[in-house]
Amino acid sequence: GLNDIFEAQKIEWHEGSHHHHHHHHGSGSLVPRGSGSVPRWRQQWSGPGTTKRFPETVLARCVKYTEIHPEMRHVDCQSVWDAFKGAFISKHPCNITEEDYQPLMKLGTQTVPCNKILLWSRIKDLAHQFTQVQRDMFTLEDTLLGYLADDLTWCGEFNTSKINYQSCPDWRKDCSNNPVSVFWKTVSRRFAEAACDVVHVMLNGSRSKIFDKNSTFGSVEVHNLQPEKVQTLEAWVIHGGREDSRDLCQDPTIKELESIISKRNIQFSCKNIYRPDKFLQCVKNPEDSSCTSEI
């Protein structure tokens, strides 16, 4: 199995390090680790450490993805893992660049129908439930690279081949150019650049900022939609409350989004999804008689 493959390759990571829960000593402080007579000092960050079984999980996800997406079976998952590892291992986790991820981006190159892209902000689960039913539409996490990294955390250390399972830089408290943030910025930019025709975005109507300029959607994807390819951005504002009949398309932050998009010579439209549960049900069974009314 996959564990044997890693064992055979002697991939180096902090064995048992998940059990060493050091207290945080402030941003980027140094703490001793190891029980040898000579203390080994290592960086301590404010964010959670690398997800346990990170190498095995990435490799397993890659193999699974190629199994269920036959068009991607040309991908060599060992090379993908090597490229992923190469992007952050032995590098300072606050000094990661998009360039570091280029070998991985190249290996993970994938053609998705450019007019079937669904972006999302702060409402990932519903977006994924939707593309699970509407199989011809794709979120970033439906692509190989997004699928590999979804919900994972990772970082290394400068000048050692170790993976840091204790802590990784937090975007706010430590630094923004950390391995996870730079990865998502890179793949999100490429995903948005690939989009064409009508692009959909699912937004969370329950949040105080329905459109947040500081989200990945607001700071990366919006600005990388290509006006010469994208005709319209259509926002779907998802309502949280059962009795919420307000037109959230009139929300000031949605107006702000419309302004940004219009200035980029892309048309903007907005729809309220008042009943997300019914919305999904109607995507599954469009012939249902209750699906003709507004959702």
Epitope: L2, T57, A60, R61, K64, E67, P70, H74, Q78, Q132
Partner: antibody, heavy 123, light 112 residues
Framework: EVQLQQSGPEVGRPGSSVKISCKAS????????MHWVKQSPGQGLEWIGW????????DYAEKFKKKATLTADTSSSTAYIQLSSLTSEDTATYFC????????????????WGQGTLVTVSS | DIVMTQGALPNPVPSGESASITCQSS???????????LNWYLQRPGQSPQLLIY???TRAAGVSDRFSGSGSGTDFTLTISGVEAEDVGVYYC?????????FGSGTKLEIK
Amino acid sequence: EVQLQQSGPEVGRPGSSVKISCKASGYIFTDYIMHWVKQSPGQGLEWIGWIDPEYGSTDYAEKFKKKATLTADTSSSTAYIQLSSLTSEDTATYFCARVAIITTVASGGFAYWGQGTLVTVSS
Amino acid sequence: DIVMTQGALPNPVPSGESASITCQSSESLLHSNGKTYLNWYLQRPGQSPQLLIYWMSTRAAGVSDRFSGSGSGTDFTLTISGVEAEDVGVYYCQQFLEYPPTFGSGTKLEIK
């Protein structure tokens, strides 16, 4: 050692539902896709669908989209198939199955199979 | 969907002789990665199917070297050299080039 242990035989009334299980052991459950296959009495094999236990995502053969629902419980490393609106056509043995990984590549063949669960639809 | 068509065997096959089972696919099963996604299974009476061959010609772990697979993009053969009593059962070919994976109708092997 990889093992897929399926639940015992089921008898279902026409129009009712049955849910059968496949408990995985000997490997990390979330690292592999689980497939389901149907074999009607004296007949060949038909692929029903797959589930990715890690994400809960699924895909189905067209003819099983309204018939079968695949789920997985990662805490018990168990995959399930629920068959709804039972008819005599659903009388069959149902297998769960999994591929092998050959040096970081999915072999494309079902190397591991459960022992099968016979579902009989009878009034 | 890709249609898999299996040929019949002249039954029963004398013990110790070779048997060849054929299978045809409605489309080429050769992937751009160079692999041909054709599998062979044996289902012994009362048992689950057992993977014999994957990628058209690669024997699965623990499978006797009496079993060999060959073919081109659409025409495939499973050869059993020196059939034995334990080889009795139904042999299925299966394509896994695309979804849904589809199986042949099966070829029954009986031994004289």
